[in-house]
């Protein structure tokens, strides 16, 4: 009896795992084995596919074959007993195009009101994604174990922290990878669950801000309790995308180790030009808080985002405000090479009622003022980039009296 060729061959590629599945064409024939050949583009000869010779089942793994994943490959299969079936040719395919991204590895660290998620590719040093390893982004689904109401978080990197959670509560999550450059969405990881801890008696420091004074950075934060010590750590922001990098390590700012005040001062030359993350932790000697929320700190913007300098021309019913470049120490103007928005606050000297104007222009009119009245003005600058949402401190208030009536022209 002639053996029939196997049919419906499926090629599944997940990361560097190459799996073939097929259907037996004749279930009634026993002791049949199956063998595959492969052919590379531009070759005439067929080569035996190692790992897929004389297979008794309907599945085989040819992951050990070192293929160029960007090169087209053709496969053929036949059944064998005493005789052999004819070859059945599988449509040619390019491994990279066919490959799916496997489930990532996930490691969770619990805080009382946050979870830190560390994500890494499921296949370490993958050949398939060798050129794309740093392009992975991840998305996750998280839910309270008790409720099951899911929240989706898209476009996160290899390390992500979810805040505003409840203490002593079990949260579950699953993560998948994506390669947006290749329009590939991966397979979800297994579900990982972790219980947040009891509430820490010491809350993390809050409202961290960086400002510039002379040649120093001044880092300030708020804290609930007195008689604490604090430490500050920094990390290159770009490393958040790549914790596999051996440079991925939070480092101490030497002048901010074990400080006893809610601020620390360190020289600007501690940081080269770049974008950094900063975090602060509090300790009372016995207990330690969890880390604060991380703030993004851009040396370029931080160094130069000084409060604006302005002149006021007073009229009877309005002020004309002319905003100039802020002055550095040494009275030299700072060149701002990124767009800014100006926030101008003004109030009647005898009142606390503040009014606000937001303007992109550097000449601003403050209208509807009363004649012969003292008004005070202060201003600050904001960057227009949402990702680097930075603000200068407010300038010192300048107070001016409006002119008598009929001088508005």
């Amino acid at each position: 009896k002639n053996l029939k060729s196997p049919q419906k061959v499926e090629v599944d590629i997940i990361d560097d795992n190459f799996i073939l599945r097929w259907n037996r064409s004749d279930e009634s024939v026993g002791n049949v084995t199956f063998s595959f050949d492969y052919q590379k583009t531009g070759m005439d000869n067929w080569i035996k596919l190692s790992g897929c010779q004389n297979i008794t089942s309907t599945k085989c793994n040819f992951s050990s074959l070192k293929l160029n994943v960007y090169e087209e490959i053709k496969l053929r299969i036949r059944a064998e007993k005493e005789n052999t079936s004819s070859w059945y040719e599988v449509d040619s395919f390019t491994p990279f195009r066919k490959a799916q991204i496997g489930p990532p590895e996930v490691h969770l660290e619990a805080e009382d009101k946050a979870i830190v998620i560390h994500i890494s590719p499921g296949t370490k040093d993958s050949v398939m994604w060798a050129l794309d390893g740093l392009s992975f982004t991840y998305s996750l689904v998280i839910w309270k174990n008790s409720s099951g109401v899911e929240e989706r978080i898209e476009n996160i990197y290899s390390r992500h922290k979810i805040y505003k959670l409840s203490p002593e509560t079990t949260y579950c999550l699953k993560v998948k990878a994506a390669l947006l450059t290749s329009w590939k969405i991966g397979v979800y990881s297994p579900v990982h669950c972790i219980k947040t801890t009891v509430e820490n008696e010491l809350p993390p420091p809050e409202n961290i801000e960086v400002s510039v004074q002379n040649q120093n950075y001044v880092l300030k934060w708020d804290y609930t309790y007195a008689n604490m010590t604090f430490q500050v750590q920094w990390l290159h922001a770009f490393l958040k995308r790549n914790p596999g990098n051996h440079l991925y390590k939070w480092k101490q700012i030497p002048d901010c180790e074990n400080v006893k005040t809610t601020q620390c001062v360190f020289p600007q030359n501690v940081f080269q030009k770049g974008i950094y993350l900063l975090r602060v932790q509090a300790s009372d000697g016995n207990n330690t808080s969890f880390w604060s929320e991380e703030i993004k700190f851009d040396t370029e913007i931080q160094a130069f985002l000084l409060p604006p300098v302005f002149n006021i021309r007073s009229l009877s019913d309005s002020f004309h405000i002319y905003i100039g470049a802020p002055k550095q120490s040494g009275n030299t103007p700072v060149i701002q090479d990124y767009p800014l928005i100006y926030e101008i606050i003004f109030w009647e000297n005898t009142s606390n009622a503040e009014r606000k104007i937001i303007e992109k222009k550097t000449d601003v009119t403050v209208p509807n003022l009363k004649p012969l009245t003292v008004y005070c003005v202060k201003a600050r600058a904001h960057t227009m980039d949402e990702k680097l949402n930075k603000s200068s401190v407010f300038s010192d208030a300048v107070c001016e009296k409006t002119k008598p009536g009929n001088t508005s022209k």
Epitope: A110, V116, H118, T197, V198, N200, N287
Partner: antibody
Framework: QVQLVQSGAEVKKPGASVKVSCKAS????????MNWVRQAPGQGLEWMGK????????HFNQKFRDRVTLTVDKSTSTVYMELSSLRSEDTAVYYC????????????????WGQGTLVTVSS | DIQMTQSPSSLSASVGDRVTITCKSS??????LAWYQQKPGKAPKLLIY???SLETGVPSRFSGSGSGKDYTLTISSLQPEDFATYYC?????????FGQGTKLEIK
């Protein structure tokens, strides 16, 4: 698979120093903290300190700070623990043990241990 | 330093028994607790980390629970190979500290 292989047993006189090695394999050596833990005969476990193999940052148990030195040879994926000014109560088995990833926000458990090195201090 | 107090210090039980070992810390350690098993002449082996997570390859009869300052290791049905000494360890604050150990013996 992850393996930590330690150097052989040592007999030392009081006042001398001992240097124990721990060779790591099966993982990215510079991505994990390496810890040292000791156990005196019939006693419990005592943490001595840890080192980051990527930049040699160290943290110590205050009890050992003045006598212990941790070093790294990245070319051979080996960590060394040197204990000086030995006394009889330093007789113990010394273990190296892999800690958490350096990229973690917080410390982690010790998931792989060396086989231990017996150091005997006797005059 | 954070003190870790284990109880009992020794325990006799039979194969098939359910066994519980407790560990108390002098400060809150926020689930940064590991349990290790050590057999004579061997290195400790990690069983549980993060107070409740089972290390890969460890049989499911081992489980961890607890939070704050109070933690428990449970062996649901003792097997002959489980007779050993068990240690808890906190890794919330340096120096990391261990409990004094619980020796589990055959009754």
């Amino acid at each position: 698979q992850v393996q930590l292989v330690q150097s052989g047993a040592e007999v030392k006189k009081p006042g001398a120093s001992v240097k124990v090695s721990c060779k790591a394999s099966g993982y990215t050596f510079t991505s994990y903290w390496m810890n040292w833990v000791r156990q005196a005969p019939g006693q419990g476990l005592e943490w001595m300190g840890k080192i980051d193999p990527s930049d040699s940052e160290t943290h110590f148990n205050q009890k050992f700070r003045d006598r212990v030195t941790l070093t790294v040879d990245k070319s051979t994926s080996t960590v060394y623990m040197e204990l000086s000014s030995l006394r009889s109560e330093d007789t113990a088995v010394y273990y190296c043990a892999r800690g958490g990833r350096i990229s973690f926000d917080y410390d982690a458990a010790l998931d792989y241990w060396g086989q231990g090195t017996l150091v005997t201090v006797s005059s | 330093d954070i003190q870790m107090t284990q109880s009992p210090s020794s325990l006799s039980a039979s194969v098939g028994d359910r066994v519980t070992i407790t560990c108390k810390s002098s400060e809150v350690i926020y689930n940064r607790l590991a349990w290790y098993q050590q057999k004579p002449g061997k290195a400790p082996k990690l069983l549980i980390y993060g107070a409740t997570s089972l290390e890969t390859g460890v049989p499911s009869r081992f489980s961890g629970s607890g939070s704050g300052k109070d933690y428990t290791l449970t062996i649901s049905s003792l097997q002959p190979e489980d007779f050993a000494t068990y240690y808890c360890q906190q890794y919330w604050n340096k120096p990391f500290t261990f409990g004094q150990g619980t020796k589990l013996e055959i009754k």
